[in-house]
């Protein structure tokens, strides 16, 4: 056959679907790699062709749309499934095409199983609720187009294996589920079962996301250096090895760029000539707050080396910070035989 | 002083992935810093593409977030640039560029790159 | 994201003459702005960052100033070597976002 543009396998589009439940799959040719939808590409006289791998097969074989009571069949650019199988999962490939022109992907699709309490292999989307912070709503996702506006679904929350129902801060409403106000107790896995009615017969949309309750930005505050801090010195003797922690508390913020730094002398310290190696831990609370943590150490501290500012920077979204550490040499205890002796007239 | 430069094939076909890497000389790649990539179409101005901080921990951008990757490699002082399912659009001169916190400090001169059958 | 908005697209100006470049923030980003130029066939070159501090080796007749949401770059008397296209960028929040630039072409 002729040439045909062939996009391959878009493995970033892993798409995942339950056993026994409707699944409608888009054409990702118009979402990500064409520049014009179906609709043009229909009325430009293009055809769009769907065909299959099975699992552990290579050989590409036409999709049956010939199943009883139509289990997979296609609309415009969307394959559907009702019900999916569980023998399903493969590669599929859409091809658009006429007699000069031809554009294929193809991507995976995985049926999975779930249990009685929801659980599977299913990658989980994460919606962030900030604590206490009044009235926050998640939605059922990926339900639009599965009925019409006409067709009134029946909805059912879970939180994890437990049905939704005189719950104290959680109150189903329909596709929503709103939280009165979010607390730590109310992170975890939440499902929404969607029945609706179709040519006689019913079907379950089930959808599954984790919620993870996070510092709210009423209460987001620059960060705060906890070390260095005025009551620690560091007193070295040269030859000896200094290490200051820098240890910065950081407010949770969406999509904030928290960042902390040394300089010395106000110089990165890979702008100076001195041998100082710098060692970073980070650690999250239970709200994603960030404590990060930099060490900065110099193996064999030189006087000179104790003359110089030490100074952490740090920076969040909300704003910034530096403190200096309180750095300096250790006068040598003095020896009783000399300096002492001296003291008392001794010649 | 700090030099960073950029190499990979001038021309990708669409549909296949644009592998690009940075060298850095005069200074190690493993500091506490973030490398990143810019990318800049003909005639157009500057597009963030993606950084990667010395842990490894990488930051993209939303736009091109399905199909790019970005990895550090300490022990050749490089990090690189993989972008998939190029096409037309995806034409650009790319840069790479050191950031240590106070914007992109230091550019490789960069390299075009054109997507086209 | 954070969308950043350059004026005018393009500003004629005579050599000796000063230049007025504006950044607009679509929410606030503190001082955290950058400054580039960039001359044809040449990555760009850092100029100003922290909202007003000049990288090293910048000349004095570049500076920057604003906070919050609104940015300035002033070139107090341009030379030849001026002429090029300007861009700010916020680094602020992920993702990074540059402005659409800004031509600085000779009068």
């Known amino acids: 056959s002729e040439r045909c543009d062939d996009w391959g396998l878009d493995t970033m589009r892993q798409i995942q679907v339950f056993e026994d439940e409707p699944a409608r799959i888009k054409c990702p040719l118009f979402e990500h790699f064409l520049k014009f939808n179906y609709s043009t590409a229909h009325s430009a006289g293009l055809t769009l062709i769907w065909y299959w791998t099975r699992q552990d097969r290579d050989l590409e074989e036409p999709i049956n749309f010939r199943l009883p009571e139509n289990r997979i069949s296609k609309e415009k650019d969307v394959l559907w499934f009702r019900p999916t199988l569980l023998n399903d999962t493969g590669n599929y490939t859409c091809m658009l095409r006429n007699t000069t022109y031809c554009s294929k992907v193809a991507f995976p699709l995985e049926v999975v199983q779930k249990d009685s309490c929801f659980n599977s292999p299913m990658k989980l989307p994460v919606h962030k609720l900030y604590i206490e912070y009044g009235i926050q709503r998640i939605t059922c996702p990926n339900v639009d187009g599965y009925f019409p506006s006409s067709v009134k679904p029946t909805i059912t929350w879970y939180m994890g294996c437990y049905k939704i129902q005189n719950f104290n801060n959680v109150i189903p409403e329909g596709m929503n589920l709103s939280f009165l106000i979010a607390l730590i107790s109310n992170n975890g896995n939440y499902t929404c079962v969607v029945t609706y009615p179709e040519n006689g017969r019913t079907f379950h949309l089930t959808r599954t996301l984790t919620v993870k309750v996070v510092g709210s930005p009423k209460n987001a505050v620059p960060p705060v250096i906890h070390s260095p801090n005025d009551h620690v010195v560091y007193e070295k003797e040269p030859g000896e090895e200094l290490l200051i922690p820098c240890t910065v508390y950081f407010s949770f913020l969406m999509d904030s760029r928290n960042e902390v730094w040394w300089t010395i002398d106000g110089k990165k310290p890979d702008d100076i000539t001195i041998d100082v190696t710098i060692n970073e831990s980070i650690s999250h609370s239970r709200t994603e707050d960030e404590t990060r943590t930099q060490i900065l150490s110099i193996k064999k501290v030189t006087s000179e080396d104790l003359k110089r500012s030490y100074v952490c920077h740090a920076r969040s979204a909300k704003g910034e910070v530096a403190k200096a550490a309180k750095v300096k040499q250790k006068v040598p205890a003095p020896r009783y035989t000399v300096e002492l002796a001296c003291g008392f007239g001794a010649t | 002083q700090v030099q960073l430069q950029e190499s990979g094939p001038g021309l990708v076909k669409p549909s296949e992935t644009l592998s690009l890497t940075c060298a850095v000389s005069?200074?190690?790649?493993?500091?506490?810093?973030?490398w990143g990539w810019i990318r800049q179409p003909p005639g157009k101005g500057l597009e963030w593409i993606g950084n990667?901080?010395?842990?490894?921990?990488?930051y993209y951008n939303p736009s091109l977030e399905r199909r790019v990757s970005i990895s550090l490699d300490t022990s050749k002082n490089h990090f690189s640039l993989r972008l998939n399912f190029v096409t037309a659009a995806d034409t650009a001169v790319y840069y790479c560029?050191?950031?240590?916190?106070?914007?992109?400090?230091?550019w490789g001169q960069g390299t075009m790159v054109t997507v086209s059958s | 994201e954070i969308v950043m908005t350059q004026s005018p697209a393009t500003l004629s100006v005579s050599p000796g003459e000063r230049a007025t470049l504006s950044c607009r923030a679509s929410?606030?980003?503190?001082?955290?702005l950058a400054w580039y130029q960039q001359k044809p066939g040449q990555a760009p070159r850092l100029l100003i960052y922290?909202?007003?501090t000049r990288a090293t080796g910048i000349p004095a007749r570049f500076s920057g100033s604003g906070s919050g949401t609104e940015f300035t770059l002033t070139i107090s008397s341009l030379q030849s070597e001026d002429f090029a296209v300007y861009y700010c960028?916020?680094?602020?929040?992920?993702?990074?976002?540059f402005g659409g630039g800004t031509k600085v072409e000779i009068k």
């Open positions: 990667i901080y010395h842990s490894g921990s990488t």
């Open positions: 922290g909202a007003s």
């Open positions: 005069g200074y190690s790649a493993s500091g506490v810093y973030y």
């Open positions: 960028q916020q680094y602020n929040n992920w993702p990074l976002t």
């Open positions: 560029a050191r950031d240590r916190f106070d914007a992109f400090d230091i």
């Open positions: 929410q606030s980003i503190n001082n955290i």
